[in-house]
């Protein structure tokens, strides 16, 4: 359905943060869900050396944070 040459056109508004208020980024499904639906990761057995399970779920941080910054402990804000 695409036709013709392409041109670059950016959006004027600043980039939105990944999740709207009251939603958090779900590491299992890799998109934003209602924060109340987040499941907590299973506790890691003592001495276990495997990485944290993929079911670990975290609130989202704002877009644009630099490398090394921790995820903010609150839902994403627009």
């Amino acid at each position: 359905m695409r036709r013709g040459p392409r041109s670059l056109r950016g959006r004027d508004a600043p980039a939105p943060t990944p999740c709207v208020p009251a939603e958090c980024f779900d590491l299992l499904v890799r998109h934003c869900v209602a924060c109340g639906l987040l499941r907590t990761p299973r506790p890691k057995p003592a001495g276990a050396s495997s990485p944290a399970p993929r079911t670990a779920l975290q609130p989202q941080e704002s877009v644009g944070a630099g490398a090394g910054e921790a995820a903010l402990p609150l839902p994403g804000l627009l």
Epitope: R11, A15, P16, T17, P18, C19, V20, E23, F25, V29, R30, H31, C32, Q58, Q60, E61, V63, G64, A65, G66, A67, G68, E69, A71, G76
Partner: antibody
Framework: QVSLKESGPGILQPSQTLSLTCSFS??????????GGWVRQPSGKGLEWLAH???????YYNPALKSRLTISKDTSKNQVFLQIANVDTADTATYYC??????????WGQGTSVTVSS | DIQMTQSPSSLSASLGERVSLTCRAS??????LNWLQQEPDGTIKRLIY???RLDSGVPKRFSGSRSGSDYSLTISSLESEDFVDYYC?????????FGGGTKLEIK
């Protein structure tokens, strides 16, 4: 402001490997919850998702093409790469990169045209 | 894979008319659906995310809704720049899948 731009070879021959680069600005792929992905569109047809990669190196591929696809990123250079091995004329398309965040693709590049021809 | 069936594939309408495009999901995708607009030069822009949320800068004549497995994009009053192509995208699960597209043409 978020912007993305794709680059590629333009034309290549069957059986060769297609290498695409997405250069972006306005966000970082080191940020929690950020990803970059690739979508293609043959002329006059619809969109087909190919692959994406997350800030934590987690990768997802289109199952129908998985054996030929390799996605990677260079966080320090703000780039995402896609390789498609053993291309055929069916791989002729416009290839788009897009930022992926909490609600899938939100910003798209302009697209780069790739023709596979002998 | 989740199949997204988009209808109609093409639609002729007049300026000022109200139109609706529909995507039907083959499996439950919750609210994980976006609507994209593609201009003739290939430029792609997201209009609606999470079924019904309007992206910043998108005119309020665009709206999204859901009824069961059917997802709709409605344009309340068509303007000249709206006569382009539209796609739905589900991101509930990988692989992400698109609808086949709707070409909106001026009558």
């Amino acid at each position: 402001q978020v912007s993305l731009k794709e680059s590629g070879p333009g034309i290549l021959q069957p059986s060769q490997t297609l290498s695409l680069t997405c250069s972006f600005s306005g966000f970082s792929l080191s940020t929690f919850g950020m990803g970059g992905g690739w979508v293609r569109q043959p002329s006059g047809k619809g969109l087909e998702w190919l692959a994406h990669i997350w800030w934590d190196e987690d990768k997802y591929y289109n199952p129908a093409l998985k054996s030929r696809l390799t996605i990677s990123k260079d966080t320090s250079k703000n780039q995402v790469f896609l390789q498609i091995a053993n291309v055929d004329t069916a791989d002729t398309a416009t290839y788009y990169c897009a930022r992926i965040a909490g609600y899938a693709m939100d910003y798209w590049g302009q697209g780069t045209s790739v023709t596979v021809s002998s | 894979d989740i199949q997204m069936t988009q209808s109609p594939s093409s639609l002729s309408a007049s300026l000022g008319e109200r139109v609706s495009l529909t995507c039907r999901a083959s499996q439950d995708i919750g609210s994980n659906l976006n609507w994209l607009q593609q201009e003739p030069d290939g430029t792609i822009k997201r209009l609606i995310y999470a079924t019904s949320r309007l992206d910043s800068g998108v005119p309020k004549r665009f709206s999204g809704s859901r009824s069961g497995s059917d997802y709709s994009l409605t344009i309340s009053s068509l303007e000249s720049e709206d006569f382009v192509d539209y796609y739905c995208l589900q991101y509930a699960s990988s692989p992400y899948t698109f609808g086949g597209g709707t070409k909106l043409e001026i009558k």
